[in-house]
């Protein structure tokens, strides 16, 4: 099966699990966490890619054509990579040297490449316009971005877990 029609689900599952762990280690929220209600207009906020019903990430949607869902996940990974590359994370206050941010960044890139179809040109997507952030803003922005990334990765990991369990091509024994 060509890579453009089906990714290595097991490898994606492993990488996405690892990403979930890294994102959690990068920002383990203390105390009570507000759980956001998914408002209808949430999609418009900062062009944050959210995995929604119409993206075909449900079991039936994945079985019918997983490309719609995978494209959505690719868009999300590119969105968060764009944020992790910005001065929000690069500027002061400096992240601790043993921070998992570098690993998180590398793993995001790894999963993106794993999902990038070989025979497709890179998709263009609208990224949030980032004005230069001030030092006092960065702890807040980092926290919000990582919390949002955690939620996104949790859903992506479930998608890949389902794919690995049900969509992996069985090995055909050779005669």
């Amino acid at each position: 099966v060509p890579r453009s029609s089906s990714p290595d689900w097991a490898q994606c599952q492993q990488l996405s699990r690892n990403l979930c762990m890294l994102a959690w280690n990068a920002h383990a929220p203390a105390g009570h966490m507000n759980l956001l209600r998914e408002e209808e207009d949430e999609e418009t906020k900062n062009n944050v890619p959210r995995i929604q019903c119409e993206d075909g990430c449900d079991p039936q949607g994945l079985k019918d054509n997983s490309q719609f869902c995978l494209q959505r996940i690719r868009q999300g990974l590119a969105f968060y990579k764009h944020l992790l590359d910005s001065d929000i994370f690069k500027g002061e206050p400096a992240l601790l040297p043993d921070s998992p941010m570098e690993q998180l960044h590398t793993s995001l890139l790894g999963l993106s490449q794993l999902l990038q179809p070989e025979d497709h040109p890179r998709e263009t997507q609208q990224m949030p316009s980032l004005s230069s952030s001030q030092q006092w803003q960065r702890p807040l922005l980092r926290s919000k971005i990582l919390r949002s990334l955690q939620a996104f990765l949790a859903i992506a990991a479930r998608v890949f877990a389902h794919g690995a369990a049900t969509l992996t091509e069985p090995l055909v024994p050779t005669a």
């Epitope: 929220p29 507000n34 900062n46 944020l83 803003q137 919000k144």
Partner: nanobody, 121 residues
Framework: EVQLVESGGGLVQAGGSLRLSCAAS????????MGWFRQAPGKEREFVAH????????YYADSVKGRFAISRDNAKNTVYLQMNSLKPEDTAVYYC??????????????WGQGTQVTVSS
């Protein structure tokens, strides 16, 4: 929307203390952090302090570090700014602000009307 109402401002002598309060109402589920800003006459609004709504981690402007303390009471949806060792240069209108967790690349989307703090020498 989140509505914010400040109180506790007033006139105080240099070296004295004041405690500002800010009560939040409305869609408080979307609050990620609360902060205090101030604007002196003829100057730009400046950041004073912020506190995360869930974990309680704090951040202060250098000019108030060691003198001001920000705290919150989630049960009352209220944030406080305890101001000690006040100086005449702390005179300003103090604004409370709330940061919306759904807005990933900007901060402090809701603002109160402000409360006047005057420190006399």
């Amino acid at each position: 929307e989140v509505q914010l109402v400040e109180s506790g401002g007033g006139l105080v002598q240099a070296g004295g203390s004041l405690r500002l309060s800010c009560a939040a109402s409305g869609q408080t589920f979307s609050i990620h952090a609360m902060g205090w800003f101030r604007q002196a006459p003829g100057k730009e609004r400046e950041f004073v302090a912020h506190i995360s709504w869930s974990g309680g981690s704090t951040y202060y402007a250098d000019s108030v570090k060691g003198r001001f303390a920000i705290s919150r009471d989630n049960a009352k949806n209220t944030v406080y700014l305890q101001m000690n060792s006040l100086k005449p240069e702390d005179t300003a209108v103090y604004y409370c602000a709330a940061d919306d967790m759904r807005e990933l690349v900007t901060t402090f989307h809701y603002w109160g009307q402000g409360t006047q703090v005057t420190v006399s020498s």
